[in-house]
């Protein structure tokens, strides 16, 4: 099976790499614009220059292209705890990240939120916090993991998943309750 190509890919595939087919004359291949620039006017004929203009402030193109407009620079989302790692230039989008001792959680492909790395209080660090993953904690005896925090087994209800980890403590609590019911 031949993979389906979009119209733009079909047009580009007729020309050698670094060139694109003139939209009004498919016998002409024009040179693509360099990153940091955009297409202002197609080349007038074979071997003639494409009219490329530099992206204006607040916009960029990160690769060679024949776009009619530069792409708008991304803004770091303060409400998600994001901070700017590097600002937008004509040939590179803004890079957003998190502060020290924080990690990124991706809610979707293009949206992340910054959260504090867990400190593993009442436990030990099994895997250190990474750029896109929270610390992995192992809890001490008498504690169980809930929302990546080590919580005392005294907070373990019988219906919760912690019952296996806290089984001796649960039995002790049950025994104490039963002893007063004679």
């Amino acid at each position: 099976l031949v993979p389906h190509l979009g119209d733009r890919e079909k047009r580009d595939s007729v020309c050698p790499q670094g060139k694109y087919i003139h939209p009004q004359n498919n016998s002409i291949c024009c040179t693509k614009c360099h990153k940091g620039t955009y297409l202002y006017n197609d080349c007038p004929g074979p071997g003639q220059d494409t009219d490329c203009r530099e992206c204006e402030s607040g916009s960029f193109t990160a690769s060679e292209n024949h776009l009619r407009h530069c792409l708008s620079c991304s803004k770091c989302r303060k409400e998600m705890g994001q901070v700017e790692i590097s600002s937008c230039t004509v040939d590179r989008d803004t890079v957003c990240g998190c502060r020290k001792n924080q990690y990124r959680h991706y809610w979707s492909e293009n949206l992340f939120q910054c959260f504090n790395c867990s400190l593993c209080l009442n436990g030990t660090v099994h895997l250190s916090c990474q750029e896109k993953q929270n610390t992995v904690c192992t809890c001490h005896a008498g504690f169980f993991l809930r929302e990546n925090e080590c919580v005392s087994c005294s907070n373990c209800k019988k219906s919760l998943e912690c019952t296996k980890l806290c089984l001796p403590q649960i039995e002790n609590v049950k025994g104490t309750e039963d002893s007063g019911t004679t």
């Epitope: 803004k75 409400e79 959680h105 939120q113 959260f115 929302e147």
Partner: nanobody, 119 residues
Framework: EVQLLESGGGLVQPGGSLRLSCAAS????????MVWVRQAPGKGLEWVSH????????FYADSVKGRFTISRDNSKNTLYLQMNSLRAEDTAVYYC????????????WGQGTLVTVSS
Amino acid sequence: EVQLLESGGGLVQPGGSLRLSCAASGFTFAHETMVWVRQAPGKGLEWVSHIPPDGQDPFYADSVKGRFTISRDNSKNTLYLQMNSLRAEDTAVYYCALLPKRGPWFDYWGQGTLVTVSS
């Protein structure tokens, strides 16, 4: 006690519109970023949109961009989601929620309102 109550769901034909509302109480609504998430039948939660406290620069998932509009009325403690050009794939239970703070889970969200897009 935080309470979030969604309304406005229902059955609508493809291409139709609906406006969801979320009445909030038990916290200072005007200080919180609010979120719409949805869960299609047999699928996981999908982040639809969120709006910061001042209402500026809301975020939209690519799947709803240009069709949905999130807004809020801080004087009425209410969050809205205007849904236009609805498609069958928008069929889901829609929940409003407070933006998580402690970790990647929702501490506070509503009971949901069902949106069904079908002819």
